[in-house]
Amino acid sequence: EDGGPACYGGFDLYFILDKSGSVLHHWNEIYYFVEQLAHKFISPQLRMSFIVFSTRGTTLMKLTEDREQIRQGLEELQKVLPGGDTYMHEGFERASEQIYYENRQGYRTASVIIALTDGELHEDLFFYSEREANRSRDLGAIVYCVGVKDFNETQLARIADSKDHVFPVNDGFQALQGIIHSILKKSCIEILAAEPSTICAGESFQVVVRGNGFRHARNVDRVLCSFKINDSVTLNEKPFSVEDTYLLCPAPILKEVGMKAALQVSMNDGLSFISSSVIITTTHCSDGS
């Protein structure tokens, strides 16, 4: 780790990277950008995948939380030799495939896609890219785009979730390092704490969920607090208020002492969830305490 800000959110992070001919002399900058960013996502529950695209898409590293596999994936990424066209949709297809398989497992982990490209997408290629990005969104993904050099910001705003999900890098590839902090800040959705972390068995409570990025949802009305009780039943609650650094949520009534509720947040009405290691436990409260 190289210090500085980090992200503690537990979600699935997909890097979709342009390796077309136009980035041939800039691959090192793309690699170092990904490497720096990858090291800032430090939750043990965070999984990562590296996908590259040119005339075809390739999954260089499938989704994994194994830090050794991620290290090896980064090594492979460094060895990539760019060449070919900018078929961005091929990259999104590879991400959608993985999200689809993960969703079939039952529990749906939130997916964040960071797609990087350096060129304008011509006609059909833009149509296909937007369509595939929409498919990824339909499967529950949040899509960010990084545009370097000759990109078309209007196109990227339609491929990404919104204009606010686009990171323009107008000063060329060497300027990629300069946006790491802002990408981290915008793409990181994390749950850091719950107040109170202990509640009285059988009583109704409100919980303040502290964290970051809760207003990064495409639609804040779709944000949910989720409580996974004793690793089995999941209860979703609509928050009373949604701010970027906290949620105010009704807590479920947990009848027995010693019950544990793991805190999760959904940004898309329960389609998928950001996990955390934050736990709310119940205790016995005598009257007046």
Partner: antibody, heavy 118, light 108 residues
Framework: QVQLKESGPALVKPTQTLTLTCTFS??????????VSWIRQPPGKALEWLAH???????YYSTSLKTRLTISKDTSKNQVVLTMTNMDPVDTATYYC??????????WGQGTLVTVSS | DIELTQPPSVSVAPGQTARISCSGD??????VHWYQQKPGQAPVLVIY???KRPSGIPERFSGSNSGNTATLTISGTQAEDEADYYC???????????FGGGTKLTVL
């Protein structure tokens, strides 16, 4: 409960066109990533994928049979139809339809045996 | 189009571990699925996306994928596991599904 059932003629003559219908229930083609594939298996031989159709009406075909196949769907009837032109005795096989997304087919129909003979 | 190659047959003693391979160029960058087919029956998906088990499939079935080979492993093989096994994958470049030639598993 997800179910698929193939229907069509048991016997077709050489050069004729085969039309097979897959009627499904328990799922919707409106789910992102979801689709229906057709697969066939000649007696005693391996499985061979034929065609796939998905929510967005994208159609994909086996390279070797592309010119003879047409796949279509009627979402309101929960049906997917496969037509295969210019049938030949080597096309004698059990034809299956299956639900799948990206190449994984998690639920299959029971299959229908089609014999091509004059 | 990609090609997936399987051994025609594999034999295993009851209770032992059976391994069925499926090889293809750079297969590890693709997702491999495995189907079990018993005589006169439709195929059944036993492993999808390299190593995921659909509900209802026994834990003795597992999958892996690295290098140029994907492997279906059946630990503690039972007589009822005797069947044909097919691997398959999605060829994105041609937008089609490819099956291996199948492996007949015999439980001795």
């Amino acid at each position: 409960q997800v179910q698929l059932k193939e229907s069509g003629p048991a016997l077709v003559k050489p050069t004729q066109t085969l039309t097979l219908t897959c009627t499904f229930s328990g799922f919707s083609l409106s789910t992102s990533g979801m689709g229906v594939s057709w697969i066939r298996q000649p007696p005693g031989k391996a499985l061979e994928w034929l065609a796939h159709i998905n929510l967005d009406d994208d159609k994909y075909y086996s390279t070797s049979l592309k010119t003879r196949l047409t796949i279509s769907k009627d979402t309101s009837k929960n049906q997917v139809v496969l037509t295969m032109t210019n049938m030949d005795p080597v096309d004698t096989a059990t034809y299956y339809c299956a639900r799948g997304g990206y190449g994984d087919m998690d639920v299959w129909g029971q299959g229908t045996l089609v014999t091509v003979s004059s | 189009d990609i090609e997936l190659t399987q051994p025609p047959s594999v034999s295993v003693a009851p209770g032992q571990t059976a391994r069925i391979s499926c090889s293809g160029d750079n297969i590890r960058s693709m997702f491999v699925h495995w189907y079990q087919q018993k005589p006169g029956q439709a195929p059944v998906l036993v492993i999808y996306a390299d190593n995921k088990r659909p509900s209802g499939i026994p834990e003795r079935f597992s999958g892996s994928n690295s290098g140029n080979t994907a492997t279906l492993t059946i630990s503690g093989t039972q007589a009822e596991d005797e069947a044909d096994y097919y691997c398959s994958s999605y060829d994105y470049n041609a937008h089609l599904v490819v099956f291996g030639g199948g492996t007949k598993l015999t439980v001795l």
